[in-house]
Amino acid sequence: LKGQEFAPSHQQVYAPLRADGDKPRAHLTVVRQTPTQHFKNQFPALHWEHELGLAFTKNRMNYTNKFLLIPESGDYFIYSQVTFRGMTSECSEIRQAGRPNKPDSITVVITKVTDSYPEPTQLLMGTKSVCEVGSNWFQPIYLGAMFSLQEGDKLMVNVSDISLVDYTKEDKTFFGAFLL
Amino acid sequence: LKGQEFAPSHQQVYAPLRADGDKPRAHLTVVRQTPTQHFKNQFPALHWEHELGLAFTKNRMNYTNKFLLIPESGDYFIYSQVTFRGMTSECSEIRQAGRPNKPDSITVVITKVTDSYPEPTQLLMGTKSVCEVGSNWFQPIYLGAMFSLQEGDKLMVNVSDISLVDYTKEDKTFFGAFLL
Amino acid sequence: LKGQEFAPSHQQVYAPLRADGDKPRAHLTVVRQTPTQHFKNQFPALHWEHELGLAFTKNRMNYTNKFLLIPESGDYFIYSQVTFRGMTSECSEIRQAGRPNKPDSITVVITKVTDSYPEPTQLLMGTKSVCEVGSNWFQPIYLGAMFSLQEGDKLMVNVSDISLVDYTKEDKTFFGAFLL
């Protein structure tokens, strides 16, 4: 190939052309979480299914030990939904008792760990106060955005309370990324 | 330029190169729902506007009878938002009356029907308890993720209660998919 | 029909091939909002960080004065999350006092301004009633979808109340777009 046949004069090629089917991609789905040690003031990371059911990794995008490993530098769209469920927050009771009413909350963070920076970077956060009247509550938090990642970066999903995560269905709680 | 100089040795092309503008894509927007028969234990499917206003289908992605029809196998990003609105859930009243407090809920499911599997597959679910203090409530549920689809697959959006869907504005309730 | 309709004569190239790394892209992050005049019945627009931290613009996608400027016609995926936080809505108090209970609400709109149309177009809206029991509440609204845009179009994010926007962290409130 001489590379000319599709190259209109207005369009200089600044980067190699890519077959779209060859790009790193992953969609991970929830599994039951085994309790793991996590450090104070640090949200625990979820682990994921990567090959059964709707889950997959392809084109050198690998999943290992709670992390998606970025095999190639570029701009990625990253997304996650976590469905939480729990019993009534103490919120309304606290309020009635006249004590200061700090609502409970649920939080999801998509975090990047990179060789080039000592601290993890929070890419996306969804956080919501939970102050429900009903005795049982459930709700999702969805996040998604585009980021420039480097080969070797690692992505994980952290949550404020792993025991509140709904792990019952692969369509309720998930995590994915794909190279644009 | 001979087009070769940017072709790193690690990057063989495993799939045909595609012009991005030629990929199947659709963005559908809400319309007023006509009551349709739906069967017990099965959430009703929404139908959609596919050509007026912000809505479009292109490159062989077709819409027919509640379904987006997938014309080509590949990895698709699929998304939907449904805005719900209603009067107060009975939740708080039930609570005050001392009856068991099972909250009402709102649910959106993006479902795939495929001829390579005999039953529908739930790809994405957003479900939320609704137990509001105010007399009128409204809120969106957003979903989006990437899935590997086959030529001939059909996608639809199901909701727990079609009468609660806000059909008044095309920017509030929508459904889309595009080949990556 | 004999089942041929999807047979891959579709692999002809109908549009110029593009190097993916050359496509217009932006991810903008929240900054503290300076009070600006906005007109009655018109939601104020947020302004954004476009180069520090996680924020970037590239390949002729420019940010200026609250707007993302679209440099090239095509189909774009556009997204935003706005995290709101506030003190208790008056909702429950109003209810107890027997006054008509119109709930407070929070709203995000992604708006397109185009030369070819005199009025701004609302592309995406997320709107939610807020009627919280707790004294302090916070929650995100996420939006994302695909739209066909024209060179010269401008995108902005409008909110119902700029004073409720959480501007404290770049991962909580953001706005982005990329050419597909």
Epitope: - | T36, Q37, F39, A45, N62, T64, N65, K66, F67, L69, V113, T114, D115, S116, Y117, P118, E119, P120, G152, K154, M156 | L1, K2, G3, E5, F6
Partner: antibody, heavy 116, light 106 residues
Framework: QVQLVQSGAEVKKPGASVKLSCKAS????????MHWVRQAPGQGLEWMGR????????KYDPKFQVRVTMTTDTSTSTVYMELSSLRSEDTAVYYC?????????WGQGTTVTVSS | EIVLTQSPGTLSLSPGERVTMSCRAS?????MYWYQQKPGQAPRPWIY???NLASGVPDRFSGSGSGTDYTLTISRLEPEDFAVYYC?????????FGGGTKLEIK
């Protein structure tokens, strides 16, 4: 109640065509795919093809490609299968079935006899 | 096309016995489906997606397997289980059935 009701038995001469019908009730055929399967006397099951009633798109087993046509009338929730250029080895019971919704449902079958 | 080979072709057994029948695919498939057919009746869906029992199927039936090798097992034969069992794959076009395993009373 979810069911598929097929048309009655047919006797045809070699070279003729036959058009069988399958009427659905209790579900929307456009939500599913409709298949045709046949079974010659004393033999196993043979898949012939399927139609997507929502779009009219079809997939056929290549061995039937030139002789079979599947169509849909959504207004009556009926699917049709026409087989042309009949020969004696087409003598069989022809079943319609649905996929894409549980339970997987089959019609009662239509006997087609091809004899001179 | 994907060829499915069922074995054995016929099984002669008595009520109360354990039964295992096999379905082997000529190339890998994602799932296997099983149907039961009795004389003069349409086939009935029996096991879907390799291991899920269709509605009304007794739990003495089970399905397993992956790739090219799949199995239907009956833990303890009952008189109503005597029938022909067909496997079917949905992964490749055309869909194909196995030749069937006839389960007859000894």
């Amino acid at each position: 109640q979810v069911q598929l009701v097929q048309s009655g038995a047919e006797v045809k001469k070699p070279g003729a065509s036959v058009k069988l019908s399958c009427k659905a009730s209790g579900f929307d055929i456009q939500d599913t795919y409709m298949h045709w399967v046949r079974q010659a006397p004393g033999q196993g099951l043979e898949w012939m093809g399927r139609i997507d009633p929502a779009s009219g798109h079809t997939k056929y087993d290549p061995k039937f490609q030139v002789r079979v046509t599947m169509t849909t009338d959504t207004s009556t929730s009926t699917v049709y299968m026409e087989l042309s250029s009949l020969r004696s080895e087409d003598t069989a019971v022809y079943y319609c079935s649905r996929s894409g919704g549980l339970p997987d449902v089959w019609g009662q079958g239509t006997t087609v006899t091809v004899s001179s | 096309e994907i060829v499915l080979t069922q074995s054995p072709g016929t099984l002669s057994l008595s009520p109360g016995e354990r039964v295992t029948m096999s379905c082997r695919a000529s190339s890998s498939v994602s799932y296997m489906y099983w149907y039961q057919q009795k004389p003069g009746q349409a086939p009935r869906p029996w096991i879907y997606a390799t291991s899920n029992l269709a509605s009304g199927v007794p739990d003495r039936f089970s399905g397993s397997g992956s790739g090219t090798d799949y199995t239907l097992t009956i833990s303890r034969l009952e008189p109503e289980d005597f029938a022909v069992y067909y496997c079917q794959q949905w992964s490749g076009n055309p869909r194909t059935f196995g030749g069937g395993t006839k389960l007859e009373i000894k």
